[in-house]
């Protein structure tokens, strides 16, 4: 019997019945054996067939076999219902053998030519599998020559058995207060030869509860308990299971908070699984009451373990803590039941006593003391002597604490002193320097430190002066004597102010002219305004039209008198404006050197001379009276002159104050 | 971690001013709370001067009422006392501290003296 | 004002001993007291607020009691380094007042 070729000899070639292509010999019995390599496969086909026909094949016939299974028997030129014949069929082995026998019986009725056939081995794909069968790999089969292999989906490994597809599903662990976990794919059919764990760990505190919901099935036995395929629950108290079957198991507290579950598949069956929602309890704490006057948010049937409420009051309440205040209150249920914070109280906001307004009083016009929300205080200022600066001094108690004013400002109103205010009536004609009397001038400053100067009081902390009067001191304003209230210079009665700072105006330059002659003193303290100590007005934009030539003005001072000594009483001295280029013209001649007066300074005076300012009125203020507001202001500072006081044809030489507006704005403003 | 941190002059004369400035960290002042001056005498005895809340509002002991100031430079997350007109009886060491006194800073130790 | 007082100035007593520090307040301050640890040249260290809320980190062995004007501080299992003085303090009303302090000390 041919033995056919063998792998790994090329396999493929011919077959023939012996004698072909001549008729056949009775008795004859051929066999052959091929063999292809493993993963391979025989084809075979016949281009000639020619055997007596016989019943059931009995006589003549070709007989292909694959292992213990015939694959065919042939007799024939053409298929019959009981016989065949292999036409155009190809004919495949079931591994990678294949046998073919041919006989012929002892006779025949006529001459046969017997059969020629051809084969070769082909690749198995081993991934097509017939319908109904199993299929090869549990997920992916991938065909190559000779072989094949299987991989699996994302989330499997292949098992070691190399074609089931085993479920990565251990080590999720499940950390929130509820959620849901099932079996791998559900619910399709669980995989095969798996081994799942799942974890619930909640702070401790937390119980776990089990709901087994939709459906149950998993791979059983109706003798022993869950053999196959199972699921296990295990807390740190006890075991759950093992549950397998249809049924739903019931509702499962496990009174833990940390939850294993185990699920265990074998090898075969085909089952939906499972599907757990679980949730947790803790032990609840004391239902929150709101404060009065406060609302509690969330509001819950229940608060347990990690919930948490805010507390929120009414618009003009607040959170207080005793008297503690609070922004926000928000209280956290902990593991014993109890609060992590006590409740706080929602109270009325209580703006507290208002602050005292400087040179002005309040009054409480919701009721004596009142100073809780919404209550309202009316702030007034001294009458006579000061007026409210901004708004109208009405103030309500609002929901932030604060006292705020109708314009929403939290700050106190200002009381600014009455400018300009003077006990004195002008006349119309000039006479000679006068005694002033109290009230006159309340303005006027005596400004000792070295020489005796003055100064005018502006607002209620500052001095206009002029800046040859305080030049030496300007470093070291502390030693300047500030004196105002009084009219007698020499008086022990006087109020006293002292300098915190001393500003000269920066285009002044000491010894070379009195360009720019003007300064500042800011005092240590507000001074207290009343009849005897009154700030003068600085001048409106319209003002010059109070200032024009022959206009008068006034002179005050303890400056020398006709008598050559200072004066020991207040005297002041009304005097005309001098027309700007006749004063110009009077200091053109020596010893003044050209350009003397400037268009910084202003003159007053006779030209007769006898009425004019003098050495101690320096720093003073030459004021008008505005007719349209009815209040003084200073339109000069008494600076320079002639040698000779009151002399004929000279005149008194005054900063012209309306020029430095800004400059005095600024300072003020800045410091 | 919240942290208040004093700072001051540690030496002031009598009838001068006292300023000293509190640093928080870790904190926002103007988030919550109330933020305290507290002083402790020779002698161990403590006494709470006042505070300013996360508002900017402010309460004071009322023995001090007419001496004490407490302001705050939210910008730089301090809060400030000023104290006017010392006497020997001020000496101590100032803590502040936040709300009920659940965070403190190590205190600044303040002496008037001539 | 309201005075915070603690009657006892010392209290002598031993590692591992169970024990109660009292505050009297003059009037109602409801439950706003807050209890401190002070040691020399140190801050006061906060232990308590509102009367019975232990502050976080503070161990277990630390126990505030009481509401209303009287109030106790208990320490159980007393340790070595508990061994300090005792503070108590009432927020409820304007000026906030501290007691003058207990000091425990070895027996």
């Known amino acids: 019997t041919p033995l056919g070729p063998k792998w790994p000899e090329p396999v493929f070639g011919r077959l023939a019945s012996p004698g072909f292509p001549g008729e056949y010999a009775n008795d004859q019995e051929r066999r052959w054996t091929l063999t292809a390599p493993p993963g391979y496969r025989l084809r075979l086909y016949f281009t000639h067939f020619d055997l007596e026909l016989s019943h059931l094949c009995e006589y003549d016939f070709v007989k292909l076999s694959s292992g213990a299974k015939v694959l065919a028997t042939l007799c024939g030129q053409e298929s019959t219902d009981t016989e065949r014949a292999p036409g155009k069929d190809t004919f495949y082995s079931l591994g990678s053998s294949l046998d073919i026998t041919f006989r012929s019986d002892y006779s025949n009725e006529k001459p046969f030519t017997g059969f020629e056939a051809f084969y070769a081995a082909e690749d198995i794909d081993e991934c097509q599998v017939a319908p109904g069968e199993a299929p090869t790999c549990d997920h992916h089969c991938h065909n190559h020559l000779g072989g094949f292999y299987c991989s699996c989906r994302a989330g499997y490994v292949l098992h070691r058995n190399k074609r089931t597809c085993s479920a990565l599903c251990s080590g999720q662990v499940f950390t929130q207060r509820s959620g849901e976990l099932s079996s791998p794919e559900y619910p399709r059919p669980y995989p095969k030869l798996s081994s799942c764990t799942y974890s619930i760990s909640l702070e401790e505190g937390f119980s776990v509860i089990l709901d087994f919901v939709e459906s149950f099935d998993v791979e059983t036995h109706p003798e022993t308990l869950c053999p196959y395929d199972f699921l296990k629950i295990q807390t740190d108290r006890e075991e759950h299971g093992p549950f397998c079957g249809k049924t739903l198991p019931h509702r499962i507290e496990t009174k833990s908070n940390t939850v294993t579950i185990t699920f265990v598949t074998d090898e075969s069956g085909d089952h939906t699984g499972w599907k757990i929602h679980y949730t947790s309890t803790a032990q609840p704490c004391p239902y929150p009451m709101a404060p009065p006057n406060g609302h509690v948010s969330p509001v819950q049937a229940k608060y347990i373990l990690k919930d948490s409420f805010s507390i929120f009051c009414e618009t003009g309440y607040e959170l207080l803590q005793g008297h503690l205040p609070l922004k926000s209150f928000t209280a956290v249920c902990q593991k014993d039941g109890s609060w992590d914070r006590p409740m706080p109280a929602c109270s009325i906001v209580d703006c507290g006593p208002p602050d005292d307004l400087p040179s002005g009083r309040v009054e409480y016009i919701t009721g004596p003391g009142v100073t809780t929300y919404k209550a309202v205080i009316q702030y007034s200022c001294e009458e006579t002597f000061y007026t409210m600066k901004v708004n109208d001094g009405k103030y309500v108690c609002e929901a932030d604490g604060f006292w705020t004013s109708s314009k929403g400002e939290k700050s106190l109103p200002v009381c600014e002193p009455v400018c300009g205010l003077s006990a004195r009536t002008t006349g119309g004609r000039i006479y000679g320097g006068q005694k002033a009397k109290p009230g006159d001038f309340p303005w006027q400053v005596l400004i000792l430190g070295g020489t005796t100067a003055a100064g005018a009081l502006l607002y209620d902390n500052w001095v206009l002066t002029a800046a040859h009067a305080v030049y030496e001191q300007k470093h070291d304003a502390s030693a300047l004597d500030i004196r105002m209230g009084t009219l007698k210079r020499l008086s022990p009665h006087y109020t006293q102010a002292w300098s915190e700072a001393v500003f000269i105006h920066e285009g002044y330059t000491h010894d070379a002219g009195f360009d720019n002659d003007i300064a500042l003193i800011k005092l240590n303290n507000k001074v207290v305004i009343n009849s005897n100590i009154t700030p003068i007005c600085l001048p409106r934009k319209e003002a010059e039209s109070f200032m024009r030539t022959d206009d008068i003005g006034t002179a005050s001072g303890w400056g020398l008198t006709q008598r050559g000594f200072l004066a020991r009483n207040l005297m002041y001295v009304d005097i005309p404006i001098v027309d700007h280029q006749k004063c110009t013209a009077a200091y053109e001649k020596p010893p003044y050197p050209r350009g003397s007066v400037t268009a910084n300074m202003l003159c007053a005076g006779l030209e007769s001379g006898g009425k004019d300012s003098c050495r101690g009125d320096s720093g003073g203020a030459l004021v008008f009276l505005d007719s349209e507001t009815e209040r003084w202001f200073v339109g000069g500072i008494v600076s320079w002159g002639s040698m000779n006081c009151g002399e004929a044809g000279q005149y008194g030489v005054y900063t012209k104050v309306i020029n430095y507006i800004p400059w005095i704005e600024n300072i003020i403003s800045d410091f | 971690e919240v942290q208040l941190q004093e700072s001051g002059p540690g030496l002031v004369k009598p009838s001068q001013s006292l300023s000293l400035t509190c640093s928080v960290t870790g904190y926002s002042i103007t988030s919550d709370y109330a933020w305290n001056w507290i002083r402790q005498f020779p002698g161990n005895k403590l006494e709470w001067m006042g505070y300013i809340s996360y508002s900017g509002r402010t309460s004071y002991n009322p023995s001090l009422k007419s001496r004490i100031s407490i302001t705050r430079d939210t910008s730089k997350n301090q809060f400030f006392l000023q104290l006017i007109s010392v006497t020997t009886e001020d000496t101590a060491t100032y803590y502040c501290?936040?709300?009920?006194?659940?965070?403190w800073g190590q205190g600044t130790t303040l002496t008037v003296s001539s | 004002d309201i005075v915070m007082t603690q009657s006892q100035k010392f209290i002598s007593t031993s590692i591992g001993d169970r024990v109660s520090v009292t505050c009297k307040a003059s009037?109602?301050?409801?439950?706003?007291v807050a209890w401190f640890q002070q040691r020399p040249g140190q801050s006061p260290k906060p232990l308590i607020y509102s009367a019975t809320f232990r502050h976080s980190g503070v161990p277990d062995r630390f126990t505030g009691s009481g509401s209303g004007t009287d109030f106790t501080l208990t320490i159980s299992n007393l340790q070595s380094e508990d061994l300090a003085e005792y503070v108590c303090?009432?927020?409820?009303?304007?000026?906030?007042?501290f007691g003058p302090g207990t000091k425990l000390e070895l027996k």
């Open positions: 501290a936040r709300y009920w006194g659940d965070y």
């Open positions: 009037q109602d301050v409801g439950g706003h």
């Open positions: 303090l009432q927020y409820n009303s304007n000026p906030l007042t």
